[in-house]
């Protein structure tokens, strides 16, 4: 069965210092899937951030960078210059 596992449950981030979120795929080969990232904020709203290849939700393209690491079978989301408004729970998902 396919499973996407976050590398860390909690990621402490400093304002302005680039941060990387990683999701490991188990049981399947990541290159065969489109990876999506979402953010859930306090109001329980799920906001779309990124989908392969190079598709970003409104307002996310300048500060977020999505990618996959074929070698490590990982999905990666970089926050280039984190600020307080980037706080929340981030979710990775996949589809074909």
């Amino acid at each position: 069965a396919i499973e996407l596992v976050p590398e860390h449950q909690t990621v402490p981030v400093s304002i302005g210092v680039p941060a990387t979120l990683r999701c490991s795929m188990k049981g399947e080969a990541i290159g065969n899937y489109y990876i999506n990232w979402y953010r859930k904020t306090q109001g329980n709203t799920m906001t779309f951030i990124y989908r392969e290849k190079d598709i970003y939700g409104p307002g996310f393209k300048d500060n977020f960078q999505g990618d996959i690491d074929i070698a490590k079978n990982l999905a990666v989301l970089k926050i280039l210059a984190p600020s307080e408004r980037d706080e929340g729970s981030y979710y990775c998902a996949c589809d074909t």
């Epitope: 049981g27 080969a29 990541i30 290159g31 065969n32 070698a71």
Partner: antibody, heavy 125, light 110 residues
């Protein structure tokens, strides 16, 4: 046991396009990456390229301008087109399944665990 | 995409151990723990012997082992047997867009 079988013309004229198909039998085409690798007579192996089941591709940089790969998951087949061939493209062409899963479900790319028997392609007029 | 460097030939007597080296660069062998080794008998397709540097696929004898140090990977065959005589190729993942093979090593069992 999954098996791979290459098919296509054994003789191609210079400047024409070499076209090969690999059929995956006794197993699914999902869960792995699919590759073409060639071997000129008496020489070493050369990676041509890979295709993912969603259709994305990676090609050997030295062949990139001439290579196109495609996949048809409904038929359990993937294909190679190599354009503008010359005598230097004469080789045995293998299709191969890439990737190995360990007991924990971790996937390791870069390992070609199942190969076709190879098909000889000669470029000559 | 230059190939990895292997010795053209190695030889050993039955029962002995031999090691085949595979030297790459920091862009391939040195950057990824994804070196694989293949055995190829004349007229046959290659067979995977080692993956991810040192892991053995099921069904492969524990006489075959792999290791890596820096930009060089190695395949060791212990207790050499006549059926081990073949060509051996190393291969390294070199980023999502490339895979490189070694030039091959002919193993002769004396």
């Amino acid at each position: 046991q999954v098996q791979l079988q290459e098919s296509g013309p054994g003789l191609v004229k210079p400047s024409e396009t070499l076209s090969l198909t690999c059929t995956v039998s006794s197993g699914s085409i999902s869960s792995y990456y699919w590759n073409w690798i060639r071997q000129p007579a008496g020489k070493g192996l050369e990676w041509v390229g890979r295709i993912y089941t969603i259709g994305n591709t990676n090609y050997n940089p030295s062949l990139k301008s001439r290579v196109t790969m495609s996949i048809d998951t409904s038929k359990n087949q993937f294909s190679l087109n190599l354009s503008s061939v010359t005598a230097a493209d004469t080789a045995v062409y293998f299709c191969a399944r890439e990737g190995y899963y360990d007991s924990s479900g971790s996937f390791f790319p870069g390992a070609f665990g199942i190969w076709g028997q190879g098909t000889m392609v000669t470029v000559s007029s | 995409s230059s190939e990895l460097t292997q010795p053209a030939s190695v030889s050993g007597s039955p029962g002995q151990s031999i090691t085949i080296s595979c030297t790459g660069t920091s862009n391939d062998v040195g950057s990824y723990n994804l070196v694989s080794w293949y055995q190829q008998h004349p007229g046959k397709a290659p067979k995977l012997m080692i993956y991810a540097g040192s892991k053995r696929p099921s069904g492969i004898s524990n006489r075959f082992s792999g290791s890596k140090s820096g930009n060089t990977a190695s395949l060791t065959i212990s207790g050499l047997q006549a059926e081990d005589e073949a060509d051996y190729y190393c291969c390294s993942f070199a980023g999502a867009t490339n895979v490189v093979f070694g030039g091959g090593t002919k193993l002769t069992v004396l």
